[in-house]
């Protein structure tokens, strides 16, 4: 659990409290909100990050057509229940005993119900489509340069194995990044595509989760890439179960 030794902080998660309590005075850190120990050598799970975000005082469509089963996170923020490994629990409930099932990125995948609602398993989100619109530029970006830069970003900043970045599409001004990661592909120690996508989403919004690093400065051949709109679609290994009423709304 390597963290910056000089002042004991977590490089990959600023929403932590750290202490030099490890062997040899090594830094160890806990996520705010949950009090769960986190590994600062990799990304913190989205569930723990959302929980930390909710515990903090409140301060201040298409190149690839998303499948009919693609989910968009319309419900916004909530205070999630995380399992002992920091993953989302399959069933989430609010203070008023309204419950729903979520996928591995914490997005609702069923109608809301009561405490009797059953969510038998945490369904994995295996395909994430990040849809970006960039601000006007003098000309279009070179597609291969853009592709290389975004792949480098996910590899170096988010530590996501390159094989999980399936494709980068570009039709000015829309960029799409496809992340794919089946249960069978994800080895121990691999960053989850859901966590990488969440860190990227927060970076794009200027709300970096990294400790002490500057905000995201995306450049393609020196030209700033400024994003003005982001949409993220989530595809699960098992299609979501919504009533017809919602699907036709």
């Amino acid at each position: 659990h390597t963290a910056a030794q000089d002042n004991c902080t977590c490089p990959t998660n600023k929403m932590t409290v750290c202490s030099p309590d490890g062997p040899g005075g090594r830094c160890q850190c806990r996520a705010l909100g949950s009090g769960m120990a986190v590994d600062c050598s990799t990304l913190t799970s989205k569930c723990l990050l959302l929980k930390a975000r909710m515990s903090a005082p409140k301060n201040a469509r298409t190149l690839v057509r998303p499948s009919e089963h693609a989910l968009v996170d319309n419900d916004g923020l909530y205070d999630p229940d995380c399992d002992p490994e920091g993953r989302f629990k399959a069933r989430q409930c609010n203070q008023t005993s309204v419950c729903w099932c979520v996928n591995s990125v914490g997005v609702r995948r069923t109608d809301k119900g009561d405490l009797s609602l059953r969510c038998d398993e945490l369904v994995r989100t295996h395909h994430i489509l990040i849809d970006l619109r960039h601000r006007p530029t003098a000309g279009a970006f070179n597609h291969s340069d853009l592709d290389a830069e975004l792949r480098r970003l996910f590899r170096e900043r988010y530590r996501l194995h390159p094989k999980f970045v399936a494709a980068v599409h570009y039709e000015q001004p829309t960029i799409q990044i496809e992340l794919r990661q089946n249960t069978s592909q994800k080895a121990a120690g691999d960053v989850d595509i859901g966590d990488a996508a969440y860190y990227f989403e927060r970076d794009i919004k200027g709300e970096s989760l990294f400790q002490g690093r500057g905000g995201l400065d995306l450049r393609v051949r020196g030209e700033p890439l400024q994003v003005e709109r982001t949409l993220i679609y989530y595809l699960d290994e098992i299609p979501p179960k919504f009533s017809m009423k919602r699907l036709t709304a």
Partner: antibody, heavy 119, light 107 residues
Framework: QVQLQQSGPGLVKPSQTLSLTCAIS??????????WNWIRQSPSRGLEWLGR?????????DYAVSVKSRITITPDTSKNQFSLRLNPVTPEDTAVYYC?????????WGQGTLVTVSS | DIQLTQSPSFLSASVGDRVTITCRAS??????LAWYQQKPGKAPKLLIY???TLQSGVPSRFSGSGSGTEFTLTISSLQPEDFATYYC?????????FGGGTKVEIK
């Protein structure tokens, strides 16, 4: 060598407030690397962590759910100490109360204070 | 909350014996476990942290091992001053929780 010295009454009436203080020597309550805890021990419940406070550019508190609605842990930087308030108390709160330093390991403990809740 | 179950609850042993105490966690806690020794009327004293790291000043006859859900504290050769109660503590997630204790008595 860090030393923690506890003080506070040993007898508290039901429905009243239990107040204990832990004076720190050899460290600072506002140290950005220390975490300060309260723990209690009783025959019925064993060792039970109650909560903690620590300073990391601002103060953070965490409490056990079992006492969350009744507990307050407060640092006092001027006296280099931190205190525990539990309100209201019942006879089930009768226990030996300890303060301790640490987060992933409690390496220094106070001497303990037996608090009896009785009318 | 994570439950810790210690076994045995009581243990009778003689000076020089090798003693092993087990602590089982209700969920995986990696190596986030500490061991404490407590004598009557005294505060607990840290022996082992991070499952196997010996706290400074603690005799080397104490050792800890394990990861995940099963942990052991071993005293290689029991000394007269080791007769006490031993507790494990998980430090992976709040609330931090303790085992029920193992009392080591003189046979």
């Amino acid at each position: 060598q860090v030393q923690l010295q506890q003080s506070g009454p040993g007898l508290v009436k039901p429905s009243q407030t239990l107040s204990l203080t832990c004076a720190i020597s050899g460290d600072s309550v506002s140290s950005t690397s220390a975490v300060w805890n309260w723990i209690r021990q009783s025959p019925s419940r064993g060792l039970e962590w109650l909560g903690r406070t620590c300073y990391r550019s601002k103060w953070y508190n965490d409490y056990a759910v079992s006492v969350k609605s009744r507990i307050t842990i407060t640092p006092d930087t001027s006296k280099n100490q931190f205190s525990l308030r539990l309100n209201p108390v019942t006879p089930e709160d009768t226990a030996v109360y300890y303060c301790a330093r640490g987060d992933f390991r409690f390496d220094s403990w106070g001497q303990g204070t037996l608090v009896t809740v009785s009318s | 909350d994570i439950q810790l179950t210690q076994s045995p609850s009581f243990l009778s042993a003689s000076v020089g014996d090798r003693v092993t105490i087990t602590c089982r966690a209700s969920q995986g806690i990696s190596s986030y476990l500490a061991w404490y020794q407590q004598k009557p009327g005294k505060a607990p004293k840290l022996l082992i942290y991070a499952a196997s790291t010996l706290q400074s000043g603690v005799p080397s006859r104490f050792s800890g091992s394990g990861s995940g859900t099963e942990f052991t504290l071993t005293i290689s050769s029991l000394q007269p001053e080791d007769f006490a109660t031993y507790y494990c503590q998980q430090v992976k997630i709040y609330p931090l929780t303790f085992g029920g204790g193992t009392k080591v008595e003189i046979k």
